[in-house]
Every structure is written in C-alpha cells, then in structure tokens.
C-alpha cells in the first residue's frame, strides 16, 4: 500500500521564499515519519528534511545548504524555503516515509511542482549610479 | 510495446530561447509520425507540433501561440522555441505518435525537462535615467 | 539463500574509531521491503539495538548513541556499514547486523557477529 | 523508549517439562490489532534465532513445541515439551517504536 501525495504544480517565489504544502492520504498523527523535500527530476538533492516522532518535537534540516522551516498538520507537511536563489528554479518533490508503528509505508512518487524563482532583479537607482573613474 | 524518450532534466533559456531534444528508442526514417513538445505538469498545453510525412516536407506547427521551429534526426526531434517569456518557465514534456506504417506506437511518458526561461532583465542606463518629474 | 557476514572487528584504543561491515547476499539492501539493522551485545549481557537503515537508505538511531554512530551502505557492493566514533570501554561487544522485513518489523535472518573490544 | 521485562531471568527445567517465559511491555505494543513483540532464541556463541513474529505466529522451521501469546502489554512464550536443544536463552523484542528494544533475556538451563 502506498501513501499519495498532492503537490501544487507550479510555485512562483517572487521574493526568493516559497511555501510549498506536501499534502498526504495519510494521517501522521502519533506516527514516526520523515517527510522530504528532493529538487531535479532524479530527486538528487534532498533539499529539507522533517523529522516526525510522537514523543520529541520535530525536527527540520538541510544537509544541502537550504534554508529552510517546515511545519506539521495531520496530513500535511508544509516546508518553508528561504534565500533561494534564480538558479534553484526546478521541480521539487515531496517523498514521505512512515516508519513506526509498522508497517513501514512511503508514497507514490508524486507528479512534483516547480518551483520558479523569480527573485529580485535589483537595478542600481539612477540617482546614484555608483563609483566612476576619475 | 512503447516508445522510449530521453530528454535532458534542465535547459536555460539566457535569450528567451531554446533548442530541446527529443531522443527516441526508434527510427523515424520513412516513417509517418507526430512528434509533440507539452508544458505543464498535466501536459495541458500542447506548444509544438512536428508531423513527419515519408512522402512530404516536415510540418512545424503551434496552436498555442508559440515561436517554434523543428528539425528531425533519424532517432530524435528537436523543437527549438524562440520569445519565451520569463512565466512560461515550466516542465516541458516530449511525446511521440507513429502512426504508419503500422503498429501504431506511441511512447512512454518521458521525466519531461524544465525549461528555465531567465529571459533579459534591462536596468536604465545610469547615464540616461529617464524623465522625471519637474 | 539469505546471509549477512560481518567483519571488521577487533581491537580498537579508547577514543577511537571503529567501522564495521555486513555483506549481504540473497537479497539487495535498495529492493523494497526489506531494511537492516545493527545490534550488539557486550559480554554476558543483553542484546541492544543501534539503528537501522530503510532500502530508500533513510536511517534511524538509538538515541543514546545517536551522536557517535553512522550507518551507511555501498549499492554497488550490497554491503552496510557502521561507523562508530570515540569509542569507550562500555563498547566492548559482538555486533551483529540482522535484516527485518516491513511488515513485522521482527529480525528474520543474523549474521554470525564480530568482537570488539575496546582496550588501551 | 518501551521497557521490556521479561520473567523468570532464568529458570532450571528438565528434559519434557513445560516451560513459560512472560514478558511485560511499560506500554501497549499493539497497532490495527497486531502485536509487535518477537520472540529469539540464543545460544552461547551464536547469533539470536527468531521463534516466534507478532506474539503468536511460528516462523517458519521453527518446532511446533514453541507457541507465543498475549497483547498489548503482556506476552508469553511456552515450549510444550523442553528437548536438550533448547536449553539456551530467550529474548522478547518489541517493534512498535523506536529505538527498538529487548527483555533482558531468561536462560533456560538443566536442572
């Protein structure tokens, strides 16, 4: 049996941040699980990590160098990316894995969103147009 | 039996513009076929159109509005899509018809490829900043 | 036939480190379904669990030793490891790897374990 | 983490006696009505052996003397009929959690 997973298809993160909600047919209320967030279309990069157990708080990490922050509803993860940069433009999917209690379930691969950095493209004001040589 | 298709995961549009490959597990030598480039996750909006005609020239065609050109190999297709703009970023999905002679075969659904369009994002020139206000 | 062959035991200096392998055959270690775990047991005691490690290649860890112990694995070679870090006196045992199914989650096959022993 | 106790620590039977080894969870290890507690025999100088799977069922090559019961906290395993190779000891081990643990183990010995 696998989980299911509902993404939005497209995230457009103007101001370099996104919140992006992997929605699950699962219930993760008292269960011990680790949701994922994995950019590119191999999923090479695990961007974020949540880290769920029904005694401990949960934890949230990078090992890849995002910033990130993720939060936790009864079938949902939502993760919080910060400081993404134009070229982290991709598709990211959301995986989850649910160890405990058994049996151990994870999902079908979902259709993953883009997420499409549009950033700030700042232009240096015309008032001040900077340094110049003598 | 299907039809495979290799893509590569990302391109870059720096201009606005883009050649995308469509490699296939066949050869489309004197064959009838209907080759297809689609964006979006869902494959919603077909862009491009390539019909191949043993007896006839290539036809290249969009009904969406895109620029596109086509070029045919004996195993692959290349769309190339010029005037992008910045928010048709998304997942472009190659997809393949021969239709004679028979069987009629069609492909298995590629990982499809994003297509980053960065476009140009002009700044005023310093020296020229414009009108403004008396 | 299923088999999990440990090595990499022996005697090992306070403090140091030590880095254990199980070489599996019968079964690939990335085929869903199955996953694999370390367990030790020091002399004349019981058995305690280390962690284990999903077929996606997702681990866990007991946490009182979550902070010295790391547990990977080689595809290629079908082969787990267990990296353990300053080691101590305490960690004088047999380290056994043994392999779980999803279901149940009970430890169906075991290696035959290999000493440490942590001694200046 | 779940305490596993098991009782007697050790025991001294003879050769067709039955014997009853019980193990008590700190809380329930039962989930959708399975019971994530297992049964090992071990050995002096080997590694464990699995008996018994979710409290009850034989794993396979395993002699029908051996049976397991119980639920959510309290467990038992019973061997009908003791043979000269099963004088060893046993460990409970729970997987309802994690970290994954064991009873502290009962030796069956000869009387």
């Known amino acids: 049996n696998k989980i299911l997973v509902k993404q939005s298809p497209m995230l457009v993160a103007y101001d370099n941040a996104v919140n992006l909600s992997c929605k699950y047919s699962y219930n993760l209320f008292s269960r011990e699980f680790r949701a994922s967030l994995h950019k590119g279309l191999d999923s090479a990069v695990e961007v974020c990590v949540v880290y769920g157990n029904y005694s401990q708080q949960l934890q949230v990490y990078s090992k890849t160098g995002f910033n990130c922050d993720g939060k936790l509803g009864n079938e949902s993860v939502t993760f919080y990316l910060q400081n993404l940069y134009v070229n982290q433009t991709d598709i990211y999917f959301c995986k989850i894995e649910v160890m405990y209690p058994p049996p151990y379930l994870d999902n079908e691969k979902s259709n993953g969103t883009i997420i499409h950095v549009k950033g700030k493209h700042l232009c240096p004001s015309p008032l001040f147009p900077g340094p110049s040589k003598p | 039996n299907k039809i495979l298709v290799k893509q590569s995961p990302m391109l870059v549009a720096y201009d606005n513009a883009v050649n995308l490959s469509c490699k296939y597990s066949y050869n489309l030598f004197s064959r009838e076929f209907r080759a297809s480039l689609h964006k979006g996750l869902d494959s919603a909006v077909e862009v491009c159109v390539v019909y191949g005609n043993y007896s006839q020239q290539l036809q290249v065609y969009s009904k969406t509005g895109f620029n596109c050109d086509g070029k045919l190999g004996n195993e692959s297709v290349t769309f190339y899509l010029q005037n992008l703009y910045v928010n048709q970023t998304d997942i472009y999905f190659c997809k393949i018809e021969v239709m004679y002679p028979p069987p009629y075969l069609d492909n298995e659904k590629s990982n499809g490829t994003i297509i980053h369009v960065k476009g140009k994002h002009l700044c005023p020139s310093p020296l020229f900043p414009g009108p403004s206000k008396p | 036939e299923v088999q999990l062959v440990e090595s990499g035991g022996g005697l090992v200096q306070p403090g140091g480190s030590l880095r254990l392998s199980c070489a599996a055959s019968?079964?690939?270690?990335?085929?869903?379904?199955?996953?694999v775990s370390w367990i030790r047991q020091a002399p004349g005691k019981g058995l305690e669990w280390i962690g284990e490690?999903?077929?996606?290649?997702?681990?866990y860890y007991s946490p009182s030793l979550k902070s010295r112990v790391t547990i990977s694995r080689d595809n290629s070679k079908n082969t787990l490891y267990l990296q353990l870090n300053s080691l101590r006196a305490e960690d004088t045992a047999v380290y056994y790897c043994?392999?779980?199914?999803?279901?149940?989650?009970?430890?169906?096959?075991w290696g035959q374990g290999t000493l440490v022993t942590v001694s200046s | 983490d779940i305490q596993l106790t098991q009782s007697p620590s050790s025991l001294s039977a003879s050769v067709g006696d039955r014997v009853t080894i019980t193990c008590r969870a700190s809380?329930?290890?039962?989930?959708?009505?399975?019971?994530?507690l297992h049964w090992y025999q071990q050995k002096p100088g080997k590694a464990p052996k699995l008996l018994i799977y979710?409290?009850?069922s034989l794993q396979s090559g395993v002699p029908s003397r051996f049976s397991g019961s119980g639920s959510g906290t309290d467990f038992t395993l019973t061997i009908s009929s003791l043979q000269p190779e099963d004088f060893a000891t046993y460990y409970c081990?729970?997987?309802?959690?994690?970290?994954?643990?064991f009873g502290q183990g009962t030796k069956v010995e000869i009387k």
């Open positions: 043994a392999r779980y199914e999803y279901y149940y989650y009970d430890f169906d096959y």
């Open positions: 019968g079964f690939s270690l990335s085929t869903g379904g199955v996953g």
């Open positions: 490690i999903y077929h996606s290649g997702s681990t």
């Open positions: 809380q329930s290890v039962d989930f959708h009505g399975i019971s994530f």
């Open positions: 979710a409290a009850s």
């Open positions: 081990q729970q997987s309802y959690r994690s970290p994954r643990t």
